[in-house]
Amino acid sequence: AVNGTSRFTCFYNSRANISCVWSQDGALQDTSCQVHAWPDRRRWNQTCELLPVSQASWACNLILGTPDSQKLTAVDIVTLRVMCREGVRWRMMAIQDFKPFENLRLMAPISLQVVHVETHRCNISWKISQASHYFERHLEFEARTLSPGHTWEEAPLMTLKQKQEWICLETLTPDTQYEFQVRVKPLQGEFTTWSPWSQPLAFRTKPAALGKDT
């Protein structure tokens, strides 16, 4: 939802968390503001305190329940409001009718581990975290490998067009240090975006076998 120079963006992690960022040019830094969540067909509502993340933007997490509980469904609509204190009163600064499963951003994949490493290849696995059972297998992943002397931005993206929680990296250089990251995205949702990148996993390929003396 955008009002002039105000921007209010929220994402649902598919289970029990809605993360919101509100930015407004010229807003007072010391103003106390909150995000209020009112589902259209649930008995609960939730509030979180917006905390500054930069000069003109604030963020907060609406914790709806235990991390793996399915607190919202595909047909829920949540009214989200930014409310800021003005003296003794609260003023509404932004509002949106939020369809959780159209605005998804999952948690970063976790538990990355090297399953098997050789001189030129490495098999890596991971797990998805706090992802709804709704998705079944309809998720996709992006992965990238950091090579020596390069940056993450230069790393080519590898796309896995299905729910495949492992990858076999090929054509690696022997006895070389690498780092690996992965992120996940459901197919569902018009405004759905990629999860954050996972924590990097560092690994080293095995040295090449020494050639036999002739």
Epitope: Q70, F101, H133, Y134, E136, H138, Q188, E190
Partner: antibody, heavy 117, light 107 residues
Framework: EVQLVQSGAEVKKPGATVKISCKVS????????IHWVQQAPGKGLEWMGW????????EYAPGFQDRVTITADTSTDTAYMELSSLRSEDTAVYYC??????????WGQGTTVTVSS | EIVMTQSPATLSVSPGERATLSCRAS??????LHWYQQKPGQAPRLLII???QSISGIPARFSGSRSGTEFTLTISSLQSEDFAVYFC?????????FGQGTKLEIK
Amino acid sequence: EVQLVQSGAEVKKPGATVKISCKVSGFNFKESLIHWVQQAPGKGLEWMGWIDNEAGETEYAPGFQDRVTITADTSTDTAYMELSSLRSEDTAVYYCARGGPWFLSYWGQGTTVTVSS
Amino acid sequence: EIVMTQSPATLSVSPGERATLSCRASQIISNNLHWYQQKPGQAPRLLIIYGLQSISGIPARFSGSRSGTEFTLTISSLQSEDFAVYFCQQSNNWPYTFGQGTKLEIK
């Protein structure tokens, strides 16, 4: 292999209630959604509702809300759809299906219900 | 309730030729549109999800596309087993609704 096996054909009188079962195998029933769809001769496919076995919630389409009840028995991996106050226009094939909320990935073979006096 | 309108009601095409089936939504549904195939005496089978993503195990000759509220299912080279009824279904607003179907028959 994913399978959904439905109970047999039923003939009912107007005003009666029918209860159809859907026994599933090949996937984790406790973490799944089971949907029910009606296919009546003149009306095409109509989504009746679903049960979310993990969350323990049901969702019914407005057109069926006051007459349909969807339940599940997780001990036998079986879902049920009960339709009450039957009328002639309820004569149809009823399907159970598995899927996320948005589309139906696997279907049962269908159960024919005939409502006739 | 969103109304899904499929056209034509019946489409006659020769084997080996291309078939184009249309589905229009009565309001904007983003890419929340899915296609099914149904053969006589059988349950529907899911073919395409989110307008254009094909389901694993479905032949590559089936493809989907979208232009606004108009969605198209294309079968590039018809095989004998493709002659069936095709349904579209929206999942943008509950209750989710199906089109009335397009019957694809042998010319």
